[in-house]
């Protein structure tokens, strides 16, 4: 029999979401206007294409990547879209308030939409650790808190460390991973007897998850190059990201086979490891001077990803309650750190090459930036986790975890869906 969406949530969710949407519309009405200076329509189209790539990554890529659960694939895709739509709206306002507001109204440009989409992507990475254990009302809270935390982190880093848009945004990998893991840590963990099958992957949803991985794989160069200032930097970023993800695919598939006693390939490893190179190369994608270095980085990232997928799920399942197939959180946490370390190595090479005494200071600044991102992620993640545990959200009972029928109307109610 169909599990009805709890009555309290039926009252709470539409009211909460629509009130929030009305508030956002009012904020847009009073505080925003469009950039009126668009002289070059060709440039507008080219600029929009980058934003479109990011939206495809978010909506299709991350939407489908998280859809591999046997009985939670609909919710994964649709909830991701819901969070993306809400997150982009709030991120545009927040970025405007934090950076432009003293001058009057917030000017909305294609660039601000690009930044907002990337901020919302952070939530979609984080939510992988909690999807299936929370309802939409809780996800609204998660979107608001995470986008706010990331926006403030970016502003603080920009003001204190003077980093540019790209370096600023590339903390997203580490931030999103640690935010998601700390939220997951706060949520009820044990799966009651008889529901273990729900967090298993199934063939059709796994295929759609692979489709998501393919979309991310194709568009990752756009993500890594979106906030770079000049054509040559973007070209370098696109090339290096492409080489890195290409190598991480080969590494992921062969490494997955190597890690299995019978030499079989794990879908879960592949879903996430194909992206490994893109994450690891992110911070320094425009700085890597030759393809072979990007390829080596892709290889190392692929190996780390497969190794992590093999040995970390047990620990994450026990401690954080994260199912075996939701490995994006710890994957991105390791690979994001690898990317940051690569940048610090470049800084060291820089200062050693120049033969000046600034090496320690520059490295300390970079470590400080990274530490700040992790601390804010953990603190805001724990805050979110505590908020999500409040009774008012009517969280799904543990027995209803990973169950589409709690949220969706299925006319035929096929039990094996």
């Amino acid at each position: 029999m169909s599990s009805k969406y709890p009555r309290s949530v039926r009252r709470c969710l539409p009211l909460w979401a629509l009130t929030l949407e009305a508030a956002l519309i009012l904020l847009f009405y009073f505080f925003t206007h469009y950039d009126a200076s668009l002289e070059d329509q060709k440039g507008l189209v080219a600029s929009y294409q980058v934003g479109q790539d990011l939206t495809v990554m978010a909506a299709i890529g991350l939407g489908f990547l998280t859809s591999s659960f046997r009985r939670h694939s609909w919710s994964s895709v649709a909830f991701n879209l819901f969070m993306l739509a809400l997150g982009v709206q709030w991120a545009i306002l927040l970025d405007g308030f934090l950076s432009q507001f003293p001058s009057g109204k917030v000017v909305i440009t294609l660039f601000s939409i690009r930044l907002a989409t990337m901020s919302a992507l952070s939530v979609l990475i984080s939510v992988d650790a909690v999807l299936g254990k929370v309802n939409l009302a809780q996800l609204v809270v998660m979107v608001l808190v995470e986008v706010t935390a990331l926006g403030n982190l970016r502003m603080v880093i920009s003001n204190i460390f003077n980093t540019d848009y790209h370096m600023n945004m590339m903390h997203i990998y580490v931030f999103a991973a640690y935010f998601g893991l700390s939220v997951a840590w706060c949520l009820p963990k044990p799966l009651p007897e008889g529901t273990e099958d729900k967090d298993q992957t199934a063939t059709i949803p796994s295929l759609s998850a692979m489709l998501g991985a393919l979309f991310l794989w194709m568009f990752w160069p756009s993500f890594n190059s979106a906030l770079l200032r000049s054509p040559i930097e973007r070209k370098n970023a696109v090339f290096n990201t492409y080489y890195a993800v290409a190598v991480s695919v080969v590494t992921a598939i062969s490494g997955s086979s190597l890690a299995h006693p019978q030499g079989k390939i794990s879908k879960t490893y592949v879903h996430s490891a194909v992206l490994a190179g893109g994450v690891a190369v992110g911070t320094s994608c425009h700085l890597i001077p030759s393809p072979w270095l990007a390829m080596v980085l892709g290889l190392v990232a692929g190996l780390i990803s497969v190794g992590g997928a093999k040995y970390l799920p047990g620990c994450c399942n026990r401690v954080l309650g994260i199912p075996h197939s939701s490995i994006m959180g710890y994957n991105f946490s390791l690979l994001g750190l690898l990317g940051e370390i690569i940048y610090i190595v470049l800084l060291v090479l820089d200062t050693v090459g120049a033969g000046n005494g600034m090496i320690g200071f520059q490295v300390l600044l970079s470590i400080g930036e990274l530490s700040l991102a992790i601390v804010i992620a953990l603190m805001s993640g724990l805050l979110t986790g505590l908020l999500l545990n409040l009774k008012i959200w009517k969280a799904p009972h543990e027995a209803k975890y990973f169950d589409d029928q709690v949220f969706w109307k299925f006319p035929h109610l096929a039990v094996g869906f």
């Epitope: 668009l38 002289e39 070059d40 440039g43 507008l44 080219a46 600029s47 980058v50 440009t109 294609l110 660039f111 690009r114 920009s158 003077n162 980093t163 540019d164 848009y165 200032r229 000049s230 054509p231 040559i232 930097e233 320094s284 425009h286 700085l287 001077p289 940048y343 470049l346 800084l347 090479l349 820089d350 090459g353 120049a354 000046n356 600034m358 200071f361 520059q362 600044l365």
Partner: antibody, heavy 127, light 106 residues
Amino acid sequence: EVQLLEESGGGVAQPGRSLRLSCVASGFSLRSYGMHWVRQAPGKGLEWVADIWFDGSNKDYADSVKGRFTISRDNSKNTLYLQMNSLRAEDTAVYYCARDWRVRAFSSGWLSAFDIWGQGTTVSVSS
Amino acid sequence: AELTQSPSSLSASVADRVTITCRTSRNINRYLNWYQQKPGKAPKLLIYAASSLQSGVPSRFSGSGSGTDFTLTITSLQPEDFATYYCQQSYSTPFTFGPGTKVDLK
């Protein structure tokens, strides 16, 4: 081929009125470079005013002009613009456009330098 | 980052060695450029990234420094070098300029 920038549109304006400056590039394609406006008040130093990325996607402004000036570009016409609204006496200056040359000067980053400048156009704001 | 230059002006003779310093209010690594401006003319890029000489600029010009302290040195001043010199940081927007140092004939 000689790479040049040429500004136009300067003149005398009353406080509160508007002016639009143009900067035409020749000898190179504007679409490959970010661009800047820099001004110099009479007898004073250089002051950075605004910049725009190569594709027009992002713009930054000095606090003194934020909300009043708008930088834009038309790559198909190889032209950069500066729309100046609500002009004040302190906006009186020679306005230069400059090309943003991005150079890989370090292992850990790219640097901007202004390698080509226009000859400047004079804006005088007085009642 | 705010930039200060010293001296604000200096008088020198042809063939003199001239040193101009630029100090920033915060660490900018080596993201510093030097420009030369002659009266009624547009500025001209001399040095980028603190110490790299722009093509076409005579080798008597050199730059050094990192972090917060930078110097521009003209080893043997020539008649065409009498001008105003500006430092500029390009570490982050706004790309601020120093107040300038005027070099004139003693």
